[in-house]
Interface confidence: low
């Protein structure tokens, strides 16, 4: 694997200044694959082509994420450089068979996340799961896990049901989560930061 | 508090332009994209385009790309909505809106929406 | 572009009635679904974000559902201030689109 990143970048960094602008503001609109999330806009936007790259494998994984850069491409009307890394990544042994979809998984990053390293306490301590599930729901939560969460008794078993979910997230789903956290129990976080 | 207010009704001759102002107050300007969306009487809305005034980018609804230019100054938090090519079909109200753009989270809607300004296309 | 279908066209409530309104998309929007409420000569208000989350300020008798498609604003006792147009708009891809609006009116 590497193949499909590394034409990712070769493609992006042939981009002028504005055509890497126009690449970000369509990427926010293409139609993606059921089970992936959009990178959010305000991180996206200020992104170079090497973090950019980074974020589209660690959000949609190389095969997908290649495909998907090329669609965004052949829509601003680059066909040549569209073919070119649809070629590049064809030529890597590895990649998905068409139609399978790949799970989004968890970016490439040191060390564990907030959320996973404080789990149990977050599980015993958090009191606002409502709140997080509202402020998840439809971005990283669908509307069966929403419910399935919502069914639970006690909010430690509410937590402890929408931990079942966090291994399928990538890093910035569970950033969504902290910051949820962040504004409804900012002492709890504080607290466990200094911990 | 937040506040966009728009400038005042506009009445104009078919095949001439009209420049619209939506002054932003009680927040950072650069911090929010600004919207235009239009309403024509007893009708739906209509997204225009949007401006980050950050930096000028722009986005428009293509069937209002020839209409509709959007700038923004930030100097005094103000974005405009030039309009051409006037015909009766232009005839609506103007609502500038705008859309929390935060790094955690892309926030596509629209929270504060201004006054509106009334544009009437007659001759 | 993605369009919006809102139903019914016009809805006549009595006040303390519970009402829903319905918003279908040509295809799947993923819960990048908004509700506005538009009271006659006034500005368009957000009353639900992303399908189902509330909006500070929003009584909490306006709550949101649904997902793919279909969605659904529901009131719950209806006020007299609540009275007025109330559109949806999607914001999957772009353009923005906005549904037709429903009127909901006094019976």
């Known amino acids: 694997m590497g193949r499909a990143r590394d034409a990712i970048l070769d493609a992006l960094e042939n981009l002028t200044a504005e055509e890497l602008k126009k690449f970000k503001l369509k990427l926010l609109s293409v139609p993606l694959r059921e089970g992936y999330g959009r990178i959010p806009r305000g991180a996206l936007l200020s992104m170079d082509a090497l973090d950019l790259t980074d974020k589209l494998v660690s959000f949609y994984l190389e095969t997908y994420g290649a495909e998907l850069t090329a669609n965004v491409l052949r829509d601003m009307g680059l066909q040549e450089m569209a073919g070119q890394l649809q070629a590049a990544t064809h030529q890597g042994s590895g990649a998905a068979p068409a139609g399978i979809q790949a799970p989004p998984q968890s970016a490439a990053k040191p060390g564990l996340h907030f959320i996973d390293q404080h789990r149990a306490a977050l599980i015993a301590r958090v009191t606002n799961v409502e709140w997080l599930l509202d402020a998840l729901y439809g971005k990283v939560l669908t509307d069966e896990q929403y419910q399935a969460v919502r069914a639970e008794p006690t909010n430690p078993s509410k937590m402890r049901k929408l931990f079942s979910f966090t291994p399928a997230w990538n890093w910035t789903c569970k950033d969504l989560l902290l910051q949820a956290l962040r504004e409804s129990q900012s002492y709890l976080v504080e607290d466990l930061e200094r911990s | 508090q937040v506040q966009l207010q728009q400038s005042g009704a506009e009445l104009v001759r078919p095949g001439t332009s009209v420049k619209l102002s939506c002054k932003a107050s009680g927040y950072t300007f650069t911090s929010y994209w600004m919207h235009w969306v239009k309403q024509r009487p007893g009708q739906g809305l209509e997204w225009i385009g949007g401006?980050?005034?950050?930096?000028?980018?722009?986005k428009y609804n293509q069937k209002f790309k020839a209409k509709a230019t959007l700038t923004a100054d930030t100097s005094s938090s103000t974005a405009y909505m030039q309009l051409s090519s006037l015909t009766s079909e232009d005839s609506a109200i103007f609502y500038c809106a705008r859309e929390e753009a935060s790094t955690v989270v892309a926030h596509w809607y629209f929270d504060v929406w201004g006054t509106g300004t009334t544009v009437t296309v007659s001759s | 572009d993605i369009v919006l279908t809102q139903s019914p066209a016009t809805l006549s409530v009595t006040p303390g009635d519970s009402v829903s309104l319905s918003c279908r998309a040509s295809?799947?929007?993923?819960?990048?679904l908004h509700w506005y409420q538009q009271k006659s000569h006034e500005s368009p208000r957000l009353l639900i974000k992303y399908t189902s989350q509330s909006i500070s300020g929003i009584p909490s008798r306006f709550s949101g559902s649904g997902s793919g498609t279909d969605y659904t604003l529901s009131i719950n006792s209806v006020e007299t201030e609540d009275f007025g147009m109330y559109f949806c708009?999607?914001?999957?891809?772009?353009?923005?689109?906005f549904g037709g609006g429903t009127k909901l009116e006094i019976k």
């Open positions: 401006i980050d005034p950050s930096d000028s980018y722009t």
């Open positions: 708009q999607q914001s999957n891809n772009w353009p923005y689109t």
């Open positions: 295809q799947s929007i993923s819960n990048n």
